[in-house]
Interface confidence: medium
């Protein structure tokens, strides 16, 4: 069947694809949509109940922030 | 210490088949999701595929999307690359890689794609 | 799709300091952090440095990682003839195109 992802494995897999950027459990507001009244969509909802792609998890990362010297 | 051993590499015809292993030792095997990293001959590193520590999910590189399966048993502490529709641009050493940030790495086995 | 760019080839003298640049973007290195992986000729790639500036145990305090905008910065100080190798930049699952260290 489809692979799903949920819980820790989830976590991990978005660690892997955003790496240190951080992520979202939900898409910021409006992310996506052009509906201002659009439910908002979890990553939950996307890749543990269905099944998703990396390219998919990547759209959970954190937005961009300036960028910061180590 | 934390060892990775791959095998199974070898020469094959285009659009053969070859299957790789990853032995791991040294560590909490379920604990690490893991992936494959390739280098073609004289050439930088490129990220295969990768999968949970659970083996419930796999992601890949567009390259080898549809022709390659990762898959791991947690049973026999195994990592698995099967590699199917085998083209020339595959040949390269495969390395496996512990984890998020690929801190430790197999010594590599080559798979050379050839007629 | 991501890409990073690093110099095909740098050297230095033994007991010299030399750096090895990765530039991408704000999208990619401006925001996500940098790993560095040593390779050794005919050997396997070794992270030598995560999270922009940490370093593994083992890895000599030789080695430093920095980030700065859309760059990130491997610097070598006390070069050895040992640290002739591929020097690879990453980030989450995106390699450069790796750095060839020539110790004169």
């Known amino acids: 069947g489809p692979e799903t992802l949920c819980g820790a494995e989830l976590v991990d897999a978005l660690q892997f694809v955003c790496g240190d950027r951080g992520f979202y459990f939900n898409k910021p507001t409006g992310y996506g949509s052009s509906s201002r009244r659009a439910p908002q969509t979890g990553i939950v909802d996307e890749c543990c109940f269905r099944s998703c792609d990396l390219r998919r998890l990547e759209m959970y990362c954190a937005p961009l922030k300036p960028a910061k010297s180590a | 210490q934390v060892e990775l051993v791959e095998s199974g590499g070898g020469l094959v015809q285009p659009g053969g088949s070859l299957r790789l292993s990853c032995a791991a030792s040294g560590f909490t095997w379920s604990s690490f999701a893991m992936s494959w990293v390739r280098q073609a001959p004289g050439k930088g590193l490129e990220w295969v595929s990768y999968i949970s520590y659970l083996g419930s999910y796999t992601g890949y590189a567009d390259s080898v999307k549809g022709r390659f399966t990762i898959s791991r048993d947690n049973s026999k502490n195994t990592l698995y690359l099967q590699m199917n529709s085998l083209r020339a641009e595959d040949t390269a050493v495969y390395y496996c890689a512990r984890g998020t940030k690929f801190d430790y790495w197999g010594q590599g086995t080559l798979v050379t794609v050839s007629s | 799709d991501i890409v990073l760019t690093q110099p095909p080839s740098v050297s230095g003298a033994p007991g010299q300091r030399v750096t090895i640049s990765c530039t991408g973007s704000s999208s990619n290195i401006g925001t996500y952090d940098v790993h560095w992986y040593q390779q050794l000729p005919g050997t396997a790639p070794k992270l030598l440095i995560y999270?922009?500036?940490k370093r593994p145990s083992g890895v000599p305090d030789r080695f430093s990682g920095s980030k700065s905008g859309t760059s990130a910065s491997l610097a070598i100080t006390g070069l050895q003839s040992e640290d002739e190798a591929d020097y690879y930049c990453?980030?989450?699952?995106?390699f450069g195109g790796g750095t060839k260290l020539t110790v004169l």
């Open positions: 990453s980030i989450t699952r995106v």
């Open positions: 999270s922009n500036s």
